[in-house]
Every structure is written in structure tokens, then in C-alpha cells.
């Protein structure tokens, strides 16, 4: 009774199509599959960025797989062939591993790469990234930003740089069609007569870095003798009402009465007859139903009532 063996996949490689971190892992079927013509061979693929503790594992019948990686670090991957138990009259058979690695060969000491990279997707409409030059680089150093997301044919360079002292320190992006809820890849590289400059790679999803505009049209409405309803409107722009969380800060007679986080555009406040002044501000943020993270907006303009008995009036701006 001969032991059934299978070879690992051939020509296993990681291919970089120039998408700044979105890589193709591809391979060919193993040699000597003739014995298993009736069989659907599967492949178990494991891959990770070098230094990561955990491998991602995929089982597939295909000869390729695509995923995003951090190109600041190397990538390692391994794959083996799986023969299901149906093919072997018994237990599953696995080949040995085929292994491969990939990295962008660095140029320059890490300190030369851009520092404090910060990207904000303002009101889910305008992406702006800014950075500081690397440490110890001269004024002749210039940085260039490239970006890619699924839907673009190739990586694009920034066409509207923000400059300081002749150096690029940021990028205003054009309208980015169908760019949210997918990985957005950025590379900032540089050049200098003086020394080599290290490239930097960044990946994020645009909906997670949204900074909305602040809420508008703040109003007061008397609900009862001891309740006041605070109302506001969502800011202008493409973000739907269901995507907002709000934080309210209310001051009563110059002392902070309450800070609260709410999911809709109203808040009911208990008051006393002694209240002489009431002020509130609101700010907004994209909530967990629409993103995994977000940035609080600036505070709205302050809306105040003062001078009349709160218990007798309906208060409108």
C-alpha cells in the first residue's frame, strides 16, 4: 500500500503591480497531478508582513490571491497543496510548503522619511494629507505623494501640493470617485542631492478619517415647565443623518451642566426655575454604523438664551 504524496505548487511568487501595497500572490499547479485528474486540488496559503505575529490563512482552488500589505515592511508567504480525503481514500494529504518573500528594497535611513503624516477626509468630500519633512533633511529635499485605490488603472501622483519654504508638505486631493469602504494606499517618496530619502507607505479607508462640518441651526424649545428640548440640524454635505453621533456641551449660568453623546438631532434637558442663562454647543462625528473610526468636527457656534424667565418662553434663535 504506497503512501500518497503530492508536490507543492510551482512558481510561487508575490507580484507587485505598482499599487503601493496591493499585491498579487500567484502560483502554478504542482507537478505530477496526473494521478488525481478526478480531484479538485486545493491550496492553503499563509502570508503576513514580516514581524507580524499572526499569519493570514486562505484555502482556495484558484491559482492567485490578492491582498493589501504594509510595504514599509517585508512580506513572507507560504503555500502547500491539499488533496481532500475524497481523493485519497482516507485522510487529507498535504504537500511540503513552497515559500517566497517580497520587499521594497529601502533607500535611506528611516529618519529621512516624512514625519507626522496626517490625512483627513473633510465632510466625506475633500481629502487632505499633510506631513513634516524628515529629520535632518536639507531644504533641497522634496517629497512626492502617490495614491491608488481599487477602481484606478494605476497609481496617481498628487497634482495639488501644499508647500512651505518651497517644500511639499501636503496634498489636496481631487474628487475621489467611489473611493470609500475600500483600502486607500499612499506612498510618499522623496529626493535630495544631499542624501537618499526613505519612502513611506500608508493604508487607510476614507470613511474612517472623516471630519464632518459642525451641526447648524441650534434652537431651544420649551417642552414643559422643567424640560427644554435642544435641537440642531445636520451639516450640509453628503453625510446622511443616520451616520452621525453628536456630543453636546451645555452650560447653565456659566457652569458646565452636562456633556452628553446622542445619536439624533435633539436632546431634552431638565432645568430649574432659577436658570438665568443657558448655552449649548454641539459637534458631530461619523458613527459606528457608517465607519470604524472618525474625527470629531469643530464645535458649532454657541447658541444661548439669557435674560428672560426660561419657564415662560419658547426659545428660538
Amino acid at each position: 500500500d504506497t503512501e500518497i504524496k503530492v508536490n507543492p505548487p510551482q512558481d510561487f511568487e508575490i507580484v507587485d503591480p505598482g499599487y503601493l501595497g496591493y499585491l498579487y500572490l500567484q502560483w502554478q499547479p504542482p507537478l505530477s497531478l496526473d494521478h488525481f485528474k478526478e480531484c479538485t486540488v486545493e491550496y492553503e496559503l499563509k502570508y503576513r508582513n514580516i514581524g507580524s505575529e499572526t499569519w493570514k490563512t486562505i484555502i482556495t482552488k484558484n491559482l492567485h490571491y490578492k491582498d493589501g500589505f504594509d510595504l514599509n515592511k517585508g512580506i513572507e508567504a507560504k503555500i502547500h497543496t491539499l488533496l481532500p480525503w475524497q481523493c485519497t481514500n482516507g485522510s487529507e494529504v498535504q504537500s511540503s510548503w513552497a515559500e517566497t518573500t517580497y520587499w521594497i528594497s529601502p533607500q535611506g535611513i528611516p529618519e529621512t522619511k516624512v514625519q507626522d503624516m496626517d490625512c483627513v477626509y473633510y465632510n466625506w468630500q475633500y481629502l487632505l494629507c499633510s506631513w513634516k519633512p524628515g529629520i535632518g533633511v536639507l531644504l533641497d529635499t522634496n517629497y512626492n505623494l502617490f495614491y491608488w485605490y481599487e477602481g484606478l488603472d494605476h497609481a496617481l501622483q498628487c497634482v495639488d501640493y501644499i508647500k512651505a519654504d518651497g517644500q511639499n508638505i501636503g496634498c489636496r486631493f481631487p474628487y475621489l470617485e467611489a473611493s470609500d469602504y475600500k483600502d486607500f494606499y499612499i506612498c510618499v517618496n522623496g529626493s535630495s542631492e544631499n542624501k537618499p530619502i526613505r519612502s513611506s507607505y500608508f493604508t487607510f479607508q476614507l470613511q474612517n478619517i472623516v471630519k464632518p462640518l459642525p451641526p447648524v441651526y441650534l434652537t431651544f424649545t420649551r417642552e414643559s415647565s422643567c424640560e427644554i428640548k435642544l435641537k440642531w440640524s445636520i451639516p450640509l454635505g453628503p453625510i446622511p443623518a443616520r451616520c452621525f453621533d453628536y456630543e453636546i456641551e451645555i452650560r447653565e449660568d456659566d457652569t458646565t451642566l452636562v456633556t452628553a453623546t446622542v445619536e439624533n438631532e435633539t436632546y431634552t434637558l431638565k432645568t430649574t426655575n432659577e436658570t438665568r442663562q443657558l448655552c449649548f454647543v454641539v459637534r458631530s462625528k461619523v458613527n459606528i454604523y457608517c465607519s470604524d473610526d472618525g474625527i470629531w468636527s469643530e464645535w458649532s457656534d454657541k447658541q444661548c438664551w439669557e435674560g428672560e424667565d426660561l419657564s415662560k418662553k419658547t426659545l428660538l434663535r
Epitope: 514581524g51 520587499w103 528594497s105 529601502p106 533607500q107 535611513i109 529618519e111 542624501k195 537618499p196
Partner: antibody, heavy 116, light 108 residues
């Protein structure tokens, strides 16, 4: 397997120059940078400089005026030249491969004595 | 330049003993650029721990590394004879790249 083999003189006259060749195998210097580091009794390990895969270099500012690192990709060789050696340059000189912002493989070292 | 100060300069440990050595940087180093090398007499340095806490290929699991900012350490959970060597910390963050003066670990 990855190897870096160094060749160069063991004895250098004061004020003369030191030349060491690092010949690599098992990897390509068009894909990896090569660093130079020395170990001396007085100063421990000192980084001298690096030649990147693309051919550009970074030097320790303390040695920039008398150090030159170059390479020949076709021969898989990296060349180290330091001028104006003095007694305090007596050390073991190493070449090392750059990988992932570390030095993951080192040459066997070249022991250099500066003396007349 | 970033100065790395290792302590102690020399230490000895018995078989099975837990060993910890430290590396203090004169200014903050990103943890992914702080590494440790092992060197034995007559041999070249070997990459031992990279990016603060990742063991290089072939390094026994009794070794570990930790730290952040300006304070880093290398620990051996149970000293073995083959661990006697000099250990250097190294920062790859800023030019010039620098090494600590080393901690020489001897078998008691």
C-alpha cells in the same frame, strides 16, 4: 545560502588608506543594501556607513570626509575605502547585509591594525 | 546622535537563572527600529532580536525583548551555557546608526 566574505590587509601604516572588499553570495546587492561596521576595544561597535541597493550612500558624519563606499553589481562586490588611518582606527571591520532595517547577516570581519 | 546606554556592563548568571539586561536611549526610538545582536569571541555579531520583541530565526524561545520610547530590555527566562556572550542593542532610527557598549553575560 547568504554569505558575505571580506578580503583586505591586516596591517596598515598610519596616514595610509584601508581598502576592504566584501563579496556576497546567496543574494543580490541590487536588492539589498550593505552596511559597514567596526568593533574596536575602545569604542565598541560603530556604524560607518551603508550603500543602498540603488547605489546611493549614507555615511556616519564622523567619517564622511575620509570614507568611500562603492560597489560593482555585476561582481556582487562592495568596496570600502577609508583614508588617513590612525592608531585609533585599529579595529575589526565588518560588512553586513541590510534587511528590514536590521543587519541580518554579517561578514567574517577583517582585523585591521594601524601601526608603523 | 542617539546614545544607547546598556546596563550592566558585565553580569554573570547560573544555569536556569532568569537574566534581564537593559538598554536606555538618550532620545526616543521607535520600537520597530530597536534591535539586539549577540556576539561571541572570535565570531561576527548575529541578529538576535529585531523590532524590540521579535526573535530572529533560530533564536531559542527562552529569549524575549520588550520596551518602548527610551527604555528597552532583553530577558532570558532560564540561562543556558550557550547564552554566554556579549549582547548589543542597536538603533536603526536616526543617523548615525548607533550601538550600545554591550552587556557581557558570563556563566557563573
Amino acid at each position: 545560502q547568504v554569505q558575505l566574505k571580506q578580503s583586505g590587509p591586516g596591517l596598515v601604516q598610519p596616514s595610509q588608506s584601508l581598502s576592504i572588499t566584501c563579496t556576497v553570495s546567496g543574494f543580490s546587492i541590487t536588492k539589498y543594501g550593505v552596511h559597514w561596521v567596526r568593533l574596536s576595544p575602545g569604542k565598541g561597535l560603530e556604524w560607518l556607513g551603508v550603500i543602498w541597493s540603488g547605489g546611493s550612500t549614507d555615511y556616519n558624519a564622523a567619517f564622511i570626509s575620509r570614507l568611500n563606499i562603492s560597489k560593482d553589481n555585476s561582481k556582487s562586490q562592495v568596496f570600502f575605502k577609508m583614508n588617513s588611518l590612525q592608531a585609533n582606527d585599529t579595529a575589526i571591520y565588518y560588512c553586513a547585509r541590510d534587511f528590514g532595517d536590521t543587519m541580518d547577516y554579517w561578514g567574517q570581519g577583517t582585523s585591521v591594525t594601524v601601526s608603523s | 546622535q542617539i546614545v544607547l546606554t546598556q546596563s550592566p556592563a558585565i553580569m554573570s548568571a547560573s544555569l536556569g537563572e532568569r537574566v534581564t539586561m537593559t538598554c536606555t536611549a538618550s532620545s526616543s526610538v521607535t520600537s520597530s527600529y530597536l534591535h539586539w545582536y549577540q556576539q561571541k569571541p572570535g565570531s561576527s555579531p548575529k541578529l538576535w532580536i529585531f523590532s524590540t520583541s521579535n526573535l530572529a530565526s533560530g533564536v531559542p524561545a527562552r529569549f524575549s525583548g520588550s520596551g518602548s520610547g527610551t527604555s528597552y530590555s532583553l530577558t532570558i527566562s532560564s540561562m543556558e551555557a550557550e547564552d554566554a556572550a556579549t549582547y548589543y542593542c542597536h538603533q536603526y532610527h536616526r543617523s548615525p546608526l548607533t550601538f550600545g557598549a554591550g552587556t557581557k553575560l558570563e556563566l557563573k
